[in-house]
């Protein structure tokens, strides 16, 4: 039985390797900022928004084009509880969380914290959905690059208990004194997987739509009191969104969330699924996606049953694209790929054979070209149109996975096992 089909990061869940490499890991990354700066012309700002304060509200990290470039960089993982959540997710002792905190607690990401929004322009909006065991801050390389090219990016923190950790406030007075209530990753029994993962992906889609509604409300001038006491005036966002130019992007479980969200909410004009983990999706969604959809896959994560489900989204009359990044692994899309040195990165499957900067660059440029095409942007991102077709030495058009004769097998399967 292969757990990868029902858990996209099963390979990271062995605790034996962790202790052996703590010292090496510390040497590889202590206190450094390795997450790449955006390649675009805009400076990038970052803030957090929670509204309302309850676990039914919206919690997101916002990346945006900023007015100035002289603020402090953004703390990458902002609370100790996130490290505890990560250690639980990795199946290690909670003390490992303290070691992770020691290693990465002071690491920053290159965005200006609470910097004012760059005024005078309406920006397209991307809602971003994180993967299983992640949270809102762990895809900053993508968020920052998009923001540097003139997007506002809302990276949602999901409250479906697929995040390693997240928090909310039990009531208004708790919010006022900053008394956080923490919600950690839910571990599932095998027999729960199909049902619960589908419940989670539905909740995640609702949270993406709710995040969009909140930002559009703010854009319309609705006064919103951020439950987090931050020095960023949300009123800056009034009239800042190009309301017709909205997309959804996500990684892994977030890739499935992209598809679920597109099928439920036509305010999203297109979607990009980064190494999507398709298992959580119900069969009913595949034929309900009128929006253009782009699959960007890693070479080493994908497997026939997953690719077959991606192909179920295809229809001759709809816009669907797929590319695969040569030599890449599942974690090439998340920030942890930049947090360690080469050897450790390889050992932990955080890095593939391809250079992490090259991989994220290809993914981001292909995404920008796709977004320009389907949001009708008047930019120069069409210079990367060839990447959408997989036309690059580091790309494979479509997939490297052979799915011949897999269709019958998939129909006869319970949908949990992975075929080799």
């Amino acid at each position: 039985f292969d757990w990868q089909y029902i858990n996209p990061v099963a390979h990271m869940k062995s605790s034996a390797w962790v202790n052996k490499i703590q010292v090496l890991m510390a040497a590889a990354s202590f206190g450094q900022t390795k997450i790449p700066r955006g390649n675009g012309p805009y400076s990038v700002g970052c803030t957090d928004l929670m509204f309302d304060h309850t676990n039914k509200g919206t919690f997101l990290r916002l990346y945006y084009p900023s007015q100035d470039n002289d603020r402090l960089d953004t703390l990458w993982i902002p609370n100790k509880e996130y490290f505890w959540g990560l250690s639980k997710f990795l199946g290690t002792h909670w003390l490992m969380g303290n070691i992770l905190r020691l290693l990465f607690g002071s690491m920053t990401t290159p965005a200006n914290w609470n910097s004012p929004l760059r005024p005078g322009e309406k920006y397209p909006l991307v809602v971003f959905s994180h993967g299983l065991g992640a949270f809102r801050t762990l895809y900053s390389a993508i968020g920052i690059d998009l923001a540097s090219h003139g997007f506002i990016v809302a990276a949602v923190e999901h409250r479906d208990r697929s995040a390693s950790a997240t928090y909310y406030f039990k009531d208004q007075s708790a919010a006022e004194i900053g008394d956080k209530s923490w919600l950690y990753l839910r571990t599932l029994k095998q027999e729960e997987e199909t049902h619960i993962r589908n419940e989670q992906v539905r909740q995640r889609a609702k949270e993406c739509s709710q995040a969009l509604s909140l930002i559009l409300d703010i854009d319309h001038g609705k006064p919103v009191k951020n439950a987090l006491d931050l020095k960023f005036d949300m009123e800056q966002l009034k009239d800042s969104i190009d309301r017709e130019k909205i997309a959804v992007i996500g990684h892994s479980f977030g890739g499935a969330t992209v598809i679920q969200t597109l099928s439920e909410d036509q305010r999203f004009r297109c979607g990009i699924a980064l190494d999507a983990w398709m298992f959580p999706l119900g069969d009913e969604v595949y034929s309900r996606i009128p929006q253009p959809l782009f699959f960007i896959n890693s070479e080493y994560f994908q497997y026939p049953a997953n690719i077959i489900k991606m192909k179920k989204c295809y229809s001759p009359d709809k816009e669907r694209k797929m590319i695969t990044i040569r030599g890449s692994v599942h974690q090439n899309f998340a920030d942890f790929t930049f947090a360690t040195g080469k050897i450790i990165g390889h050992m932990l499957k955080l890095k593939g054979d391809i250079d992490s900067n090259v991989a994220i660059d290809l993914s981001n440029k292909a995404s920008l070209a796709f977004l320009q095409k389907h949001l009708g942007l008047h930019k120069d991102f069409d210079q990367w149109d060839c990447l959408i077709e997989g036309d690059d030495e580091n790309l494979i058009p479509g997939t490297n996975i052979n799915t011949t004769n897999q269709h019958i097998m998939l129909q006869n399967s319970s949908g949990i096992e992975k075929y080799n």
Partner: antibody, heavy 116, light 112 residues
Framework: QVKLEESGPELVKPGASMQISCKAS????????MNWVKQSHGKNLEWVGL????????TYNQKFKGKATLTVDKSSSTAYMDLLSLTSDDSAVYYC?????????WGQGTTLTVSS | DIVMTQTPLTLSVTIGQPASISCKSS???????????LNWLLQRPGQSPKRLIY???KLDSGVPDRFTGSGSGTDFTLKISRVEAEDLGIYYC?????????FGSGTKLEIK
């Protein structure tokens, strides 16, 4: 139930242009693409092109590029086909057809006669 | 363009007898998603076409089960187990896998 209601028959002069409409009901208009098919001499069927009502993306049969233009009005769930520079060869019955798992549900057809 | 070759051109059948129509495509109609977009249509006199079968073998709702579709790749067949009077008209195969979508030339079913 699904309904595709096309505009009535037309008699037009050569060189003129005209528009055929197709009002959809009974399903989610923006989820399914709308195709247009030409039937000449009561037999021959030719695919003109399709439009995705969600975003207006079109794909045309090369043969009808410059002859047909497809548009939609989402607010009224209506698809349109404009036919330009008409000649007697354009005389035919034109159908709007929904796409679901292939060419699916057909409108009743609009008869176009081009004659001076 | 994909050529859809339909045979025979005309079919004369006695009521209650079986009938079979063949459709061959010039290229495989298997799409990337594993589906084959080959449909069969019936156009009764004075009416617009109506789909009977989609994805080679699936019956549209309300279509009697005396109709069956079969085939794969480039070779497809429509069979009627026992022809009834209401079955007369022109039968078309149509492919929706490759642009431009293309139709067979039609098979006229007559009642003997």
């Amino acid at each position: 139930q699904v309904k595709l209601e096309e505009s009535g028959p037309e008699l037009v002069k050569p060189g003129a242009s005209m528009q055929i409409s197709c009002k959809a009901s009974g399903y989610s208009f923006t989820v399914y693409t709308m195709n247009w098919v030409k039937q000449s001499h009561g037999k021959n069927l030719e695919w003109v092109g399709l439009i995705n009502p969600f975003n207006g993306d079109t794909t045309y049969n090369q043969k009808f590029k410059g002859k047909a233009t497809l548009t939609v009005d989402k607010s009224s769930s209506t698809a349109y086909m404009d036919l330009l520079s008409l000649t007697s060869d354009d005389s035919a019955v034109y159908y709007c057809v929904r796409f679901w798992e292939g060419i699916d549900f057909w409108g009743q057809g609009t008869t176009l006669t081009v004659s001076s | 363009d994909i050529v859809m070759t339909q045979t025979p051109l005309t079919l004369s059948v006695t009521i209650g007898q079986p009938a079979s129509i063949s459709c061959k495509s010039s290229q495989s109609l298997l799409y990337i998603n594993g589906k084959t977009y080959l449909n069969w249509l019936l156009q009764r006199p004075g009416q617009s076409p109506k789909r009977l079968i989609y994805l080679v073998s699936k019956l549209d709702s309300g279509v009697p089960d005396r109709f069956t579709g079969s085939g794969s790749g480039t070779d497809f067949t429509l069979k009627i187990s026992r022809v009834e009077a209401e079955d007369l008209g022109i039968y078309y195969c149509v492919q929706g896998t490759h642009f431009p979508f293309t139709f067979g030339s039609g098979t006229k079913l007559e009642i003997k």
